[in-house]
Interface confidence: low
């Protein structure tokens, strides 16, 4: 009687000896075994010589066998798949001679500290190589030269500080590269060569953004649709690109793809991509939306372009359902901008909660204007292109409402300015009204002149404790307060400098809301400068305190709508959480300092 179970589902005889407390190969294995499972045994050491007479052997599973040593002293010429994962291997012997037909090699979750230069020599058929979760600190040059058919390479969760510049040379079939969770500071210039990699994972490294990062920055911009955030148990094809997951460790975790690189030397011989940083600026704007949610016990600041580095980036980053699939062909118009993504705050209690909505719009006028074209073409290098579509969703296990959707879309080119809209809503089944949807629609810059002045009139603050509407008006135009919205608008069809009108209102509670007490104190801080050469900066902040009990039907919406001729281009909006233990919102930096 066989110790192991035997079946023949395919043309190969499959023998399963898993978890049989084996310390050696069983003596009664069928000679025509094609698939052999030896996982979860206590083999300690293993020699391929013990399997040479199994002439059918195609798949060999030696995972979780407490292996400390592997000897390749017998040739298994038909072996295509070898699983050595979850063992205690500190080194790998040369495999090519013994395993010339190997197509998949899994040595993940071992204790490999280094690899010898010729360890993969002879593995000309290798298509998948899994080395994640080891202790690799470096890789030998030429490691992958013998494996020209490689399609998948996983080096995640190691201690790699740098990569050999020619690591990927010749790997024309490579389609998936995992490099997340290492100690990488930069990517060597030319590292990716001309490879078109549909799936790349680069997050949770120590990317150091200085002039050396420019090659990598531009590669990210050019390949924004192919950079993903890895999520346990989720197939890469079921996720959505997340280029903003690649962050500068030295710049408050700002996305690498948006690193400005100002002051960096540029010469055609120095970088592959970045020879255009000196091109004159065109009109550009930057809108920052900031949310702060503070509870008595726990404070979470939804702030821009910063991620809490202390927690697991794989779990904290919100993944994206697919809006499109990457292709190996590059489109003529590369949409490179993408929102940053949030960390997930811990589950918050229903305590008195302070909210802050901060709109910071910076208009940078310039004599240069853009003539929109009828076809999509790559913009001049200094123009920040826009991401057409990306979506953000909350992981199912999260109980904290967080901003969960960010959609950026670019309408077709038009010479008529079109509104730029941001909509933020909360989900119904929530214990705390935290914005959960942000929709941003952006356009190519309009040819209409940019206003250089703005007039804002602030009304006297209401003396009531619970005002429901605060309205900012101009002499010529006012906007009717709209319940549940905060709206920033400008008059339509204006050709002269446009005064700004803003309406701020609190979300109206639904009829099922109980025990709602609101204290609202809107504050407007405006900095206006008139010379064309200087930016116009308007900072609009609204703070209010709410102690509440929410039922599932509650829904509130905050809308920020710059109307026509507002010239707001929103190339970059990022919502990221950072946590503090401060209980008072007024000790929070968001509250401390109002600009004069």
């Amino acid at each position: 009687q066989h110790t192991c179970s035997i079946s023949k589902v395919t043309s190969l005889l499959e023998v399963n000896c898993e978890n049989k407390k084996l310390t050696a190969l069983p003596a009664d294995l069928p000679a025509d075994t094609g698939i052999l499972h030896l996982g979860e045994n206590q083999l300690g050491t293993f020699s391929t010589a013990s399997l040479v007479h199994f002439t059918h052997l195609t798949y060999l599973y030696l995972d979780r066998c407490e292996l400390t040593s592997l000897q390749t002293n017998g040739k298994l010429i038909k072996l295509e798949n070898l699983d050595l994962s979850h063992n205690n291997l500190k080194s790998l012997p040369s495999l090519g001679w013994a395993l010339p037909a190997l197509t998949t090699l899994d040595v993940s979750f071992n204790k490999l500290g280094s690899l010898s230069p010729g360890v993969l020599d002879g593995l000309s058929q290798l298509q998948e190589l899994y080395l994640q979760n080891n202790d690799l600190k470096s890789l030998p040059p030429g490691l992958l030269l013998p494996t020209t058919k490689l399609k998948k390479l996983n080096l995640a969760n190691n201690k790699l500080r740098e990569l050999p510049s020619g690591l990927l040379d010749g790997l024309e079939d490579l389609d998936t590269l995992y490099l997340q969770r290492n100690w990488l500071r930069t990517i060597p210039k030319g590292f990716f060569g001309t490879l078109l990699l549909p799936f790349v994972f680069l997050h949770a490294n120590s990317w150091y953004c200085d002039c050396e990062i420019l090659y990598f920055r531009h590669w990210l911009q050019e390949n924004a649709n192919n950079v993903y955030l890895w999520k346990q148990g989720v197939d890469v094809k079921d996720t959505t690109p997340n280029v903003a997951s690649v962050r500068c460790a030295n710049l408050d975790n700002a996305p690498v793809y948006s690193y400005p690189g100002k002051g960096c030397p540029t010469s055609s011989g120095d970088t592959d991509y970045d020879d255009y940083d000196d091109i004159p600026d065109v009109p550009a704007t930057r809108t920052e939306v900031k949310f702060s949610t503070n509870t008595k016990v726990h404070t979470t600041h939804w702030s821009l372009l910063a991620a809490a580095p202390s927690t697991s980036q794989d779990s904290q980053m919100i993944s994206l359902p697919p809006t499109h699939k990457p292709t190996k062909k590059q489109s003529t118009f590369i949409h490179t901008q993408s929102p940053g993504f949030t960390t997930l705050p811990e589950t918050m209690e229903s305590n008195p909660t302070f909210y802050s909505l901060k709109l910071n719009t910076v208009l940078i006028p310039s004599p240069t204007t853009l003539e929109p074209t009828s076809t999509q073409a790559t913009p001049e290098p200094n123009i920040q292109p826009m991401l057409t579509t990306s979506t953000l969703t909350t992981p199912e296990h999260s109980t904290t409402p967080v901003p969960t959707t960010t959609i950026l879309t670019t309408p077709e080119h038009s010479t008529i300015p079109v509104p730029t809209t941001a909509i933020l809503t909360t989900p119904k089944p929530s214990t705390i009204p935290v914005p959960t949807t942000a929709t941003l629609t952006t356009l190519e810059p309009s040819t209409t002149p940019v206003p250089t002045t703005a007039t804002l009139t602030t009304p006297e603050p209401s003396t009531t404790l619970v005002p429901t509407t605060a309205t900012l008006t101009t002499p010529e135009h006012s906007t009717t307060p709209v319940p549940t919205t905060a709206t920033l608008t400008t008059p339509e069809h204006s050709t002269t400098p446009v005064p700004t009108t803003a309406t701020l209102t609190t979300p109206e509670p639904s009829t099922t809301l109980t025990n709602l007490v609101s204290t609202i104190s809107p504050v407007l801080t405006t900095t206006l400068t008139t010379p064309e050469s200087t930016p116009i900066e308007t900072i609009l902040e609204q703070f209010f305190t709410t102690e509440l009990t929410l039922l599932p039907t509650l829904e509130s919406t905050t809308t920020i709508i710059p109307e026509q001729n507002s010239f707001l281009n929103l190339p970059e909006v990022a919502l990221v959480s950072s946590d503090t233990s401060e209980s008072s919102p007024f000790l929070n930096s968001d509250f401390c300092c109002f600009l004069p």
Epitope: S11, A27, P30, A31, H53, T55, H56, K75, K78, Q125
Partner: antibody, heavy 118, light 113 residues
Framework: QVQLVESGGGVVQPGRSLRLSCAAS????????MSWVRQAPGKGLEWVAS???????YYPDSVLGRFTISRDNSKNTLYLQMNSLRAEDTAVYYC????????????WGQGTLVTVSS | DIVMTQSPDSLAVSLGERATINCKSS????????????LAWYQQKPGQPPKLLIY???TRESGVPDRFSGSGSGTDFTLTISSLQAEDVAVYYC?????????FGGGTKLEIK
């Protein structure tokens, strides 16, 4: 019945390349491993290359890195790409069907002569 | 690599008589797990490709006359033609299919005496 027909042989100079083809019929080509075996004039048989039904190739050391076996199941055709040819590669090259994974050869083609000479 | 050595190089036998060809391997071809010896025999007539006669030492390929038989174990093997026929004139090769690279013996030329 099973038929294997080789083509592509000829005279070639040392260092040059040649590609042999083997058209198969009379059996489900994609289900069988296939091989090339050669025979130098007046000499014995020498195994050159095999490829599994799944497309995995393997070779003896004498041709490893120089010869490449491949197959196109849609065309029922086996190939042998021979690069850096040497005088000692002169032989009749037979296409053969391998029985299962046991690597004995149950059907053979008539062969095609490759002569490597300057 | 496993080296296969055939003897004799050539053999002349009268029609109707028994012909015996030997093959020796440099290492055992016995798979102790299934007790099979991985040895095959081929017949090659002038101007023709080889033809499979026997595999696993003694299993006759379909269509092969039963006057052909194989025996042996480990490293020593024998092909026997019990009653030689005129159409049996050919060169006979043994081949080990135990371990790659698959190797052949040098061949034994069988003639009629």
């Amino acid at each position: 019945q099973v038929q294997l027909v080789e083509s592509g042989g000829g005279v070639v100079q040392p260092g040059r390349s040649l590609r042999l083809s083997c058209a198969a019929s009379g059996f489900t080509f994609s289900s069988f491993a296939m091989s090339w075996v050669r025979q130098a004039p007046g000499k014995g048989l020498e195994w050159v290359a095999s490829i599994t039904s799944a497309g995995t190739p393997y070779y003896p050391d004498s041709v490893l890195g120089r010869f490449t076996i491949s197959r196109d199941n849609s065309k029922n055709t086996l190939y042998l790409q021979m690069n850096s040819l040497r005088a000692e590669d002169t032989a009749v090259y037979y296409c053969a069907r391998s029985r299962g994974y046991e690597d004995y050869f149950d059907y053979w083609g008539q062969g095609t002569l490759v002569t490597v000479s300057s | 690599d496993i080296v296969m050595t055939q003897s004799p190089d050539s053999l002349a036998v009268s029609l109707g008589e028994r012909a015996t060809i030997n093959c020796k391997s440099s290492q055992s071809l016995l798979n102790s797990r299934n007790q099979k010896n991985y040895l095959a025999w081929y017949q090659q007539k002038p101007g023709q490709p080889p033809k499979l006669l026997i595999y696993f030492t003694s299993t006759r390929e379909s269509g092969v006359p039963d006057r052909f038989s194989g025996s042996g174990s480990g490293t020593d093997f024998t092909l026997t033609i019990s009653s030689l026929q005129a159409e049996d004139v050919a060169v006979y090769y043994c081949q080990q299919h135990y371990s790659s690279p698959w190797t052949f013996g040098g061949g034994t030329k069988l003639e009629i005496k």
